[in-house]
């Protein structure tokens, strides 16, 4: 009788994560008596996957009934495959022995490759906001995919970006891989509504790439422009001065009015108007009683936006003395070289 041979007909098996892998093995003889064991890897560090006689292997089922006398099919199924299951599996015939069974003959091995989908890409931007014209970095990460080949693209509002660097780790053989990419994006004042998209394509996704997005609204800070103007007289002794705060983002803004350097009023932007580009406008006004002032008045609109150092714009009101019988003071608005008197 010819000596028993262990036949593993499949050199390799490719399985998608979550599915069941079938590893085929047959023996050419029932002799010698003894069990079959399955291992992942070879040599002293090999991992026992299934032992016909001892142990509990909840993920493994046999294809046929190994207790039947004439059974020579020792194929197994491994359920719920993960990338960690990748490797070369050996079907090994043992003969009975004491205290342990004696390895008799091994199959040639079957390489199990696991196709695992990448995780949804996670895009993260800089920790602090940046202003237009600055370049900011976005990172994109996706994990747990196999095989290693993967494609990553960056887009800003549908336009592909070219300034990025991508790494796939680890460099050598592994059960699964991770991708990490950093893209550089130049901000513009119109980017409040913009989106940065990281797109990952992999063989497991069947042509339907995964996308991760970041809204530039989380990243950009558009500083306001200020304009202080004097409105027509409201009453004989009052002047209405407005501070137009334009094109700012985000909304967090505090405005302080100063009269000759002294705080007159502080308020927080509330009823703002939104521009088409996503920035905000806001207006604050101050009613100045000119009769309360003997000298010229310097009015300052000071704005603290999103925790940044304050910016300000000033406006001079000229107060001129008139004959007391006229019963009123006059105020003059300083508009650069032009000087208008208001009575």
């Amino acid at each position: 009788e010819e000596e028993l041979q262990v036949i593993q007909p499949d050199k390799s098996v490719l399985v998608a994560a979550g599915e069941t892998a079938t590893l085929r093995c047959t023996a050419t003889s029932l002799i010698p008596v003894g069990p079959i064991q399955w291992f992942r890897g070879a040599g002293p560090g090999r991992e026992l996957i299934y032992n016909q006689k001892e142990g509990h292997f909840p993920r493994v089922t046999t294809v046929s009934d190994l207790t039947k006398r004439n059974n020579m099919d020792f194929s197994i199924r491994i359920g719920n495959i993960t990338p960690a299951d990748a490797g070369t599996y050996y079907c090994v015939k043992f003969r009975k022995g004491s205290p342990d069974d004696v390895e008799f003959k091994s199959g040639a091995g079957t390489e199990l490759s696991v196709r695992a989908k990448p995780s949804a890409p996670v895009v993260s931007g800089p920790a602090a906001r940046a202003t237009p014209q600055h370049t900011v970095s976005f990172t994109c990460e996706s994990h747990g995919f196999s095989p290693r080949d993967i494609t990553l693209k960056w887009f800003k509002n549908g336009n592909e970006l070219s300034d990025f660097q991508t790494n796939v780790d680890p460099v050598g053989e592994s059960v699964s891989y991770s991708i990490h990419s950093t893209a550089k994006v130049v901000l513009t004042r119109e980017d409040v509504h913009s989106q940065v998209i990281c797109e990952v394509a992999h063989v497991t996704l069947q042509g339907d790439p995964l996308r991760g997005t970041a809204n530039l609204s989380e990243t950009i800070r558009v500083p306001p422009t200020l304009e202080v103007t004097q409105q027509p007289v409201r009453a004989e002794n009052q002047v209405n001065v407005t501070c137009q705060v334009r094109k700012f983002y985000p909304q967090r803004l505090q405005l302080t009015w100063l009269e000759n350097g002294n705080v007159s009023r502080t308020e927080t932007a509330s009823t703002v108007t939104e521009n088409k580009d996503g920035t905000y406008n806001w207006m604050s006004w101050l009613l100045v009683n000119v009769s309360a002032h003997r000298d010229d008045v310097k009015l300052t609109c000071q704005v603290e936006h999103d925790g940044q150092p304050a910016v300000s714009k000033s406006h001079d009101l000229k107060v001129s003395a008139h004959p007391k019988e006229q019963g009123s003071n006059t105020a003059a608005e300083n508009t650069g070289s032009n000087e208008r008197n208001i009575y």
Epitope: V33, G34, E54, G55, T67, R69, K96, S98, P99
Partner: antibody, heavy 120, light 107 residues
Framework: QVQLVQSGAEVKKPGASVKVSCKAS????????MHWVRQAPGQGLEWMGY????????KYNEKFKGRVTMTSDKSTSTAYMELSSLRSEDTAVYYC?????????????WGQGTTVTVSS | DIQMTQSPSSLSASVGDRVTITCKAS??????VAWYQQKPGKAPKLLIY???YRYTGVPSRFSGSGSGTDFTFTISSLQPEDIATYYC?????????FGGGTKVEIK
């Protein structure tokens, strides 16, 4: 290490029954088959039957059918062999012995034996 | 039932001698034959199974061969500790049956 420890010697009268136990240790009790083999004084070895503790399946030698009952207790890893309607020719040493499968009749571990004497 | 006819029933040999025991099956048992050693007052010990496979820990002087109906058990160089009775057994089909035994003694 694998051990099969059998119960002590028994003296029985003809017509009585005897129940011999075999406690297994050092291996997974339900993964192997337990056989019973007897040996009359100065005689050869005679296979009586087996029990597979995994599914409590049994197979008896036709010679003993109707008189022998083999059982097992998974909780204590113990196999039992009961022989009824004893006669003097049942006087023998009774051994339990382990095999790998129910279709495997080569026995790698044996108990120390239990002497059963049938005498009036 | 399959009958196993073992011969001789006893033999006497000197230390260092080559000892051969034969076993004949009443029908083809392929290579499903085991050989046991039994010393007085002790349980049998498995030496050879599947006709030619030596069980773990069994000295290499013990060997088995044969297939079909004719089987041979050999002790290549008899040692004093080999004094025992040797049994062949077919493990091809139930009921498993044993040969009558061969008692080996030292001259």
């Amino acid at each position: 290490q694998v051990q099969l420890v059998q119960s002590g010697a028994e003296v029985k009268k003809p017509g009585a029954s005897v129940k011999v136990s075999c406690k297994a240790s050092g291996y997974t009790f339900t993964s192997y088959v337990m056989h019973w083999v007897r040996q009359a004084p100065g005689q050869g070895l005679e296979w009586m039957g087996y029990i597979n503790p995994y599914n409590d399946g049994t197979k008896y030698n036709e010679k003993f059918k109707g008189r022998v009952t083999m059982t097992s207790d998974k909780s204590t890893s113990t196999a039992y062999m009961e022989l009824s309607s004893l006669r003097s020719e049942d006087t023998a040493v009774y051994y339990c012995a382990r095999s790998y499968y129910d279709y495997d009749g080569s026995f790698d571990y044996w108990g120390q034996g239990t002497t059963v004497t049938v005498s009036s | 039932d399959i009958q196993m006819t073992q011969s001789p029933s006893s033999l006497s040999a000197s230390v260092g001698d080559r000892v051969t025991i034969t076993c004949k099956a009443s029908q083809d048992v392929t290579t499903a034959v085991a050989w046991y050693q039994q010393k007085p007052g002790k349980a049998p010990k498995l030496l050879i199974y599947s006709a030619s496979y030596r069980y773990t820990g069994v000295p290499s002087r013990f060997s088995g061969s044969g297939s079909g109906t004719d089987f041979t058990f050999t002790i290549s160089s008899l040692q004093p500790e080999d004094i025992a009775t040797y049994y062949c057994q077919q493990h091809y089909s139930t009921p498993w049956t044993f040969g009558g035994g061969t008692k080996v003694e030292i001259k």
